[in-house]
């Protein structure tokens, strides 16, 4: 078959499964004169051969774990052995079969965990390797806890990340582990290849011994601090302690206050730095954080609660300079006139803000003093004697003492005696007819004027008219404002009208007074009026079920994956067509009919997450009205960014000659997301030839120390290649270079000769 099994000399790639006994040729290359024979070079491992006539074949089973790719070259030679064509690259990709079992790096692991550690934060990693291809299920490992000893009430206290092998506490473990009850646990962990999904997978087990240690990183009890303290500040109010010495403590103001009156020292003692004012702020909640020497948090922050205790430092205040009440002249003994509500800024429901009311003066004292009484705690004024006569005294002024346990304040009340409310409001019309409005009539529009009259004393609560819609408007779309001078009522639209839910509304208005009617008089039909409102349809835009739609997917989802969907309805019931707007990265497409959103390109969290686009719903037919909603696609991270140096390390130097081995610290980072445990880089010297002179040791997940192994270095620049592995799934690795100069040192560090430059003395 020309093309598949034979053909001219050109670059080619062939895939062969490992472990298969050689059974057939790989390819037959055809020679063109003057070529008469072929030559095979490269990674043949004495397995791959080529016959004189161009027959490429292999002589024994391949092993991917020995070599996963054989890079060969084939050249066509003339009769003198000179190359006349090529050499061209021929790549043999050895495809993996599951011929290796996973193996734990240790048969026993030991670790410790503090009680109350954050659930899900690994405190120990088990690690297994499988020589098979990690890009296939054959080399994809899955970890599992097989046994937990002891097991209390059948509750698992430990969990394992089946991909990373990170062992952490469960929620129950975080809450219930107690070294006083059970100081140690044993886990049996299994690892399976084939992603743990196949009956044919290979497995291995290991044992993990875990010691539970006491956690002293605990939130202290809430603190109570008296306001306006006169003691010298700062005052220690509480403390936190990290489990090991050397932590760096800081406080984080949860509420971003303009003034944050707390501090913490490096022992973990927390202080209030200035007097507090409960009336400004009655409680503070902030966090205490413990970090390592590189500024990385050691654990979750602790919440510190400070409650400010009240002292009586505020007098009562009157509601206004003069409080005005009305009383009808025929009101009976004991009737309530109104309540004086003074205020005290001290803590509510305490003695500091409990107010006492007392009338200290009444003017005029006609026909006698003591016409009014006030309820001591409620401040309610009542009629204490007989009914009042407007023609005798139309107005009374009261001076009322309002006191808390330490302060007294005088408030002033004016009581106007008004005519009795024996007349009801009477509508000019009992029927205001009907009105037709479009459903999109503006909110706030006045649609009708209504009028009732009341024969009681003008400009008093007896004659003032309040209008209410008492029937036909359960949604509260209408309201009525009253002109206080004319008692005219203006019917306004308070909420949008809606043809679809209320095409016809039979409205009933009621007119009433703020003052009660006298005994024996009641509102009758004259105080009611009706009105019919017809609402006409307006074609309205579709309505989305949500203003913002949100979805979450992994950044490595396959192209064509459904990542979310949106829904909208048209009030008139028309069909809807969906489209996207603002898909600047060209990542998405939307099904016009269903609103389902699919990926059409590779997604990248590091380019920005969430990715925000607008979705547009448009009526099909009609006037093609549309509305817009937001679609936010949250991309979860996969490990697709190799490690790199966190910054440019330009001026790394040692003073020459070295008196003792030296070291320097550098930091790595990558652009992937590191929830919970942060980055977990491992570091190694990349070149064997450098390992005699240099060593690299890990400090924490992001920092490492590069050290010299001896002192015998020349006065020159050395380039040290360091391999950084991010330990992700799959692990990504990169090689970075640090340039380290060994130089003579002056007072200001490295002294480098300037060299000859125009105009610059050396």
């Amino acid at each position: 078959q020309e093309g598949k099994f034979s053909g001219p000399l050109k670059p080619m790639t062939f895939s062969i499964y490992e472990g298969q006994e050689p059974s057939q040729i790989i390819f037959q290359f055809k020679a063109n004169p003057p070529a008469v024979t072929f030559e095979l070079t490269g990674e043949t491992d004495n397995i791959f051969k080529i016959e004189r006539e161009g027959l490429l074949y292999y002589t024994k089973a391949l092993d991917r774990e020995t070599r996963s790719t054989h890079n060969l070259q084939v050249a066509a030679l003339d009769a003198n052995g000179a190359i006349v064509e090529g050499p061209v690259p021929i790549t043999i990709e050895v495809k993996d079969v599951n011929d290796n079992r996973p193996t734990f790096l240790q048969s026993k692991y030991e670790g410790s965990v503090r009680q109350n550690s954050r659930p899900g934060k690994p405190f120990l990693y088990v690690n297994a390797t499988d020589l098979d291809d990690p890009a296939t299920p054959n080399g994809q490992l899955s970890y599992q806890i097989v046994i937990q000893l002891p097991m209390i009430n059948n509750v698992m206290y430990f969990q394992i990340n089946n991909k990373t092998g990170g062992i952490s506490l469960t929620r129950e473990g975080s809450q219930e582990l107690n070294p006083a009850k059970n100081p140690s646990y044993n886990l049996v962990i299994s690892v399976k290849d084939m992603g743990g999904q196949s009956e044919n997978s290979f497995s291995d087990t290991t044992s993990v011994d875990i010691i539970v240690t006491e956690n002293i990183w605990k939130a202290p009890e809430p603190v109570e601090m008296v306001e306006n303290s006169t003691d010298p500040h700062p005052i220690k109010i509480t403390q936190v302690r990290w489990n090991d010495p050397g932590a760096q403590y800081s406080l984080v103001d949860k509420e971003k206050l303009p003034r944050f009156p707390f501090s913490i020292d490096q022992e973990g003692d927390i202080y209030v730095t200035q007097p507090l004012d409960r009336e400004e702020k009655d409680a503070y909640v902030f966090y205490a954080v413990a970090k390592d020497e590189y500024g990385k948090p050691l654990s979750y922050p602790l919440e510190i609660h400070v409650k400010v205790q009240d002292i009586n430092d505020n007098p009562p205040t009157c509601p206004s300079p003069v409080t005005v009440f009305e009383v009808q002249e025929n009101e009976r003994l004991g009737n309530s006139i109104g309540a004086l509500t003074a205020h005290d800024s001290d803590e509510e429901n305490t003695a500091n803000s409990l107010l006492n009311y007392r009338i200290v003066e009444q003017t005029p004292k006609l026909p006698m003093d003591g016409l009014f009484l006030i309820q001591t705690y409620a401040g309610m004024l009542q009629l204490a004697k007989q009914s009042l006569k407007k023609q005798d005294t139309p107005q009374y002024n009261l001076t009322i003492e309002v006191s808390d346990k330490d302060f007294k304040t005088l408030c002033f009340v004016q009581i106007n005696v008004i005519d009795i409310n024996d007349q009801i409001p009477i509508f000019e019309k009992s029927d205001y007819g009907n009105l037709t409005l479009a459903e999109d009539t503006n909110v706030g529009s006045t649609i009708l004027t209504i009028q009732a009259t009341d024969a009681d004393e003008p400009f008093t609560g007896s004659s003032k008219i309040l209008y209410h819609v008492i029937k036909g408007d359960s949604e509260g779309r209408l309201g009525v404002d009253t002109d206080p001078h004319t008692n005219t009522g203006y019917v306004i639209i308070k909420k949008p009208l809606d043809f679809e839910t209320a095409a016809i509304s039979n409205i009933v208005f009621k007119a009433e007074n703020p003052e009660p009617l006298v005994f024996g008089v009641t509102y009758n039909a004259s105080s009611f009026a009706k009105f019919t409102l017809f609402v006409t349809d307006v074609n309205e835009a579709p309505e989305f079920s949500q203003y913002v739609f949100q979805a979450k997917v992994s950044e490595d989802v396959a192209i064509g994956t459904k990542v979310g969907n949106v829904t909208a309805k048209d009030p008139e019931g028309l069909d809807i067509s969906y489209s996207l707007r603002g898909d600047t990265r060209g990542w998405l497409k939307i099904d016009h009919v269903t609103g389902e959103i699919f990926s059409v390109a590779p997604l990248d969290r590091e380019a920005g997450s969430p990715y925000r686009v607008q979705v547009v719903a448009t009526e099909v037919g009609g006037s093609s009205l549309s509305s817009v909603s937001q679609f936010h696609l949250i991309l979860t991270d996969v490990n697709d960014n190799p490690p790199r140096l966190a910054k440019d390390y330009m001026d790394l130097y040692f003073c020459h000659p070295l008196s003792a081995p030296g070291s320097l610290i550098f930091e790595a980072t990558d652009d992937d997301q590191h929830l919970f445990r942060g980055p977990h880089f491992t570091f190694s010297i990349a070149s064997e030839s450098l390992q005699n002179d240099w060593q690299v040791s890990k400090i924490n997940g992001t920092h490492a120390r590069l050290s010299t192994r001896h002192t015998d270095f020349e006065e020159k620049e050395y380039v040290v290649s360091i391999r950084i592995n991010d330990g992700g799934r799959p692990p990504l690795e990169s090689t970075v270079s640090l340039t380290v100069t060994f130089c003579s040192c002056g007072e200001d560090g490295c002294f480098r000769p300037a060299g000859h430059q125009p105009g610059i003395p050396t």
């Epitope: 004169p33 003057p34 070079t41 003339d78 009769a79 003198n80 052995g81 000179a82």
Partner: antibody, heavy 119, light 112 residues
Framework: QVQLVQSGAEVKKPGASVKVSCKAS????????IHWMRQRPGQGLEWIGY????????KYNEKFKDRATLTADTSTSTAYMELRSLRSDDTAVYYC????????????WGQGTTVTVSS | DIVMTQSPLSLPVTPGEPASISCRSS???????????LYWFLQKPGQSPQVLIY???NLASGVPDRFSGSGSGTDFTLKISRVEAEDVGVYYC?????????FGQGTKLEIK
């Protein structure tokens, strides 16, 4: 045993042509290439070109491409080198040699043919 | 064309003493298959050339083992461990990596 026997000495006038033969024996003539070299008096060796008797393919040194023709007669296992438009500086000993296929070296040389170009 | 340069051009040697001839090429003769396409031969007085060393270091059949070849991609050496009277003649190096094949100028070995 393997041997190459060349034709005898030639004396030619300038502008004439000469055709030197090289008869092979002791091996399969079509398996190996035959190369032609010359050595001028007191000088080093120069490569003229080669012929592959199996298919008659030839390759020449650019310097001789327009004047030299290499041929082979497989029926008599004989290779020929013809040089045209002779000049006095073509006076030399002309050698044929077998280039050993697969080992890639000159393993057998002819005894040489002296060509003298003189007016 | 690849230029081949030999040194010395004349080499007087006492019988039983070692001798060494150098050859340099203007381009590396090492090919990706690991072979170096350099050839040494000897032309004794009045005779046709005869092979000594092929592919830089391989001793041809019938050649005494006092002859050896070595070198890198561009610098090559032919060594005779103990010169004998029959070794006199002109020694040539030749490259056959590329056409045209080219020769060194030759080194004349004579007995002191």
């Amino acid at each position: 045993q393997v041997q190459l026997v060349q034709s005898g000495a030639e004396v030619k006038k300038p502008g004439a042509s000469v055709k030197v033969s090289c008869k092979a024996s002791g091996y399969t003539f079509t398996d190996h290439t035959i190369h032609w070299m010359r050595q001028r008096p007191g000088q080093g060796l120069e490569w003229i070109g080669y012929i592959y008797p199996r298919d008659g393919y030839t390759k020449y040194n650019e310097k001789f491409k327009d004047r030299a023709t290499l041929t082979a007669d497989t029926s008599t296992s004989t290779a020929y080198m013809e040089l045209r438009s002779l000049r006095s500086d073509d006076t030399a000993v002309y050698y044929c040699a077998r280039f050993y296929y697969g080992y890639w070296y000159f393993d057998v040389w002819g005894q040489g043919t002296t060509v003298t170009v003189s007016s | 064309d690849i230029v081949m340069t030999q040194s010395p051009l004349s080499l007087p040697v006492t019988p039983g003493e070692p001798a060494s001839i150098s050859c340099r090429s203007s381009k590396s003769l090492l090919r990706s298959n690991g072979n170096t396409y350099l050839y040494w031969f000897l032309q004794k007085p009045g005779q046709s050339p005869q092979v000594l060393i092929y592919r830089m270091s391989n001793l041809a059949s019938g050649v005494p083992d006092r002859f050896s070849g070595s070198g890198s991609g561009t610098d090559f050496t032919l060594k005779i461990s103990r010169v004998e009277a029959e070794d006199v003649g002109v020694y040539y190096c030749m490259q056959h990596l590329e056409y045209p094949f080219t020769f060194g100028q030759g080194t004349k070995l004579e007995i002191k």
